[in-house]
Amino acid sequence: ELCDDDPPEIPHATFKAMAYKEGTMLNCECKRGFRRIKSGSLYMLCTGNSSHSSWDNQCQCTSSATRNTTKQVTPQPEEQKERKTTEMQSPMQPVDQASLPGHCREPPPWENEATERIYHFVVGQMVYYQCVQGYRALHRGPAESVCKMTHGKTRWTQPQLICTGEMETSQFPGEEKPQASPEGRPESETSCLVTTTDFQIQTEMAATMETSIFTTEYQ
């Protein structure tokens, strides 16, 4: 079942899924000046069986100027740099696909893809939050959100995270300033309160993540 909405927005924070549950959809969108190839897929879909999950369909963009051609232009470094997303993107795959049954990894970038990735999540998906550069986290609980089904409707749990400016002095007792920027893995990832196996796997996996997965754009 698809979630009715996106995860909640937290001021000065972004969210990221470490892996995507089967059924997750990703829009195939192209940046300005490019369009999907004729009859090209509108979506990629995470599908699979008990042993293997992968993304169905391929996103392909072609120049808007040229009709009936699938020739793709290699973007210049500065064009690639402009790609930022609300979700924290990573060019690397931190988790072996096989280590998380029923989930797909972050799909690799396609040429001339849009500046944002639009995901449609399914019930049971967990996303992790972190403050954007220049802000630091004040944790009151797990910095994560889960899409749950209650009374026939879907809802996302509220992440317990407040992002405060570096210059602001208010902080919880004993909280230290982050070493890296963007900030490393939220400490609360190891204290997930959800008991479903899927979430436990994901939380355990997240606990072993390197901070390098939290990049906000492709290099």
């Epitope: 969108e29 509108l42 979506y43 369909n57």
Partner: antibody, heavy 115, light 108 residues
Framework: QVQLVQSGAEVKKPGSSVKVSCKAS????????INWVRQAPGQGLEWMGR????????DYAQRFQGRVTITADKSTNTAYMELSSLRSEDTAVYYC????????WGQGTLVTVSS | EIVLTQSPGTLSLSPGERATLSCRAS???????LAWYQQKPGQAPRLLIY???SRATGIPDRFSGSGSGTDFTLTISRLEPEDFAVYYC?????????FGGGTKVEIK
């Protein structure tokens, strides 16, 4: 609860333009496609185009290309569909719908083109 | 573009009966990106099924969708008085999005 509220009915002269608005509340707006679909009296549904507000890039059905413009204002959570060079055959109810599988629809806007 | 053909055009049935509506695509609809809608006079369409077989929020379980590739079916297991309406299928596999011509389910 997600709601899409459209602007009121319009009566237009042939050759003129019409701009219909669709205001979203109660759910994700900027990151999901907003589609425009029309339905002529007694006829079926016809897709006109879509926009993903956060990207600002629209996609149009070929038969409306050059005559329709779909825009979105993220600050007011409102999508717009403007149809120009109106003719009598454009008389229809125009709907906006969220996501490509239409999980939420506006109530519809009747546009009558008559001289 | 993908052309969707619905059959029959009209289905005359009595309350309590089973309704089977068909939607055939001119080419394969990838990943079963097919939706079904119900529309009553003077109202906007209402999503029943997406992804060929997933029921939308709040849709009774008497509605079910099946099929893949080019052949899809919407089944209403036991028609209720409020189910008499026009039903449309729609693909969102590729652009342009396209709709079937509709099937009218009327009271016999």
């Amino acid at each position: 609860q997600v709601q899409l509220v459209q602007s009121g009915a319009e009566v237009k002269k042939p050759g003129s333009s019409v701009k219909v608005s669709c205001k979203a509340s109660g759910g994700t707006f900027s990151r999901y496609p907003i589609n425009w679909v029309r339905q002529a009296p007694g006829q079926g549904l016809e897709w006109m185009g879509r926009i993903i507000p956060i990207l600002g890039i629209a996609d149009y059905a070929q038969r409306f290309q050059g005559r329709v413009t779909i825009t979105a204002d993220k600050s007011t959570n409102t999508a717009y569909m403007e149809l120009s060079s109106l003719r009598s055959e454009d008389t229809a109810v125009y709907y906006c719908a969220r996501r490509d599988w239409g999980d939420y629809w506006g109530q519809g806007t009747l546009v009558t083109v008559s001289s | 573009e993908i052309v969707l053909t619905q059959s029959p055009g009209t289905l005359s049935l009595s309350p309590g009966e089973r309704a089977t509506l068909s939607c055939r695509a001119s080419q394969s609809v990838s990943s079963s990106f097919l939706a079904w809608y119900q529309q009553k006079p003077g109202q906007a369409p209402r999503l029943l099924i997406y992804g060929a077989s997933s029921r939308a929020t709040g849709i009774p379980d008497r509605f079910s969708g099946s099929g893949s590739g080019t052949d899809f079916t919407l089944t209403i297991s036991r028609l209720e008085p409020e189910d008499f309406a026009v039903y449309y299928c729609q693909q969102y596999s590729s652009s342009p999005l396209t709709f079937g011509g509709g099937t009218k389910v009327e009271i016999k």
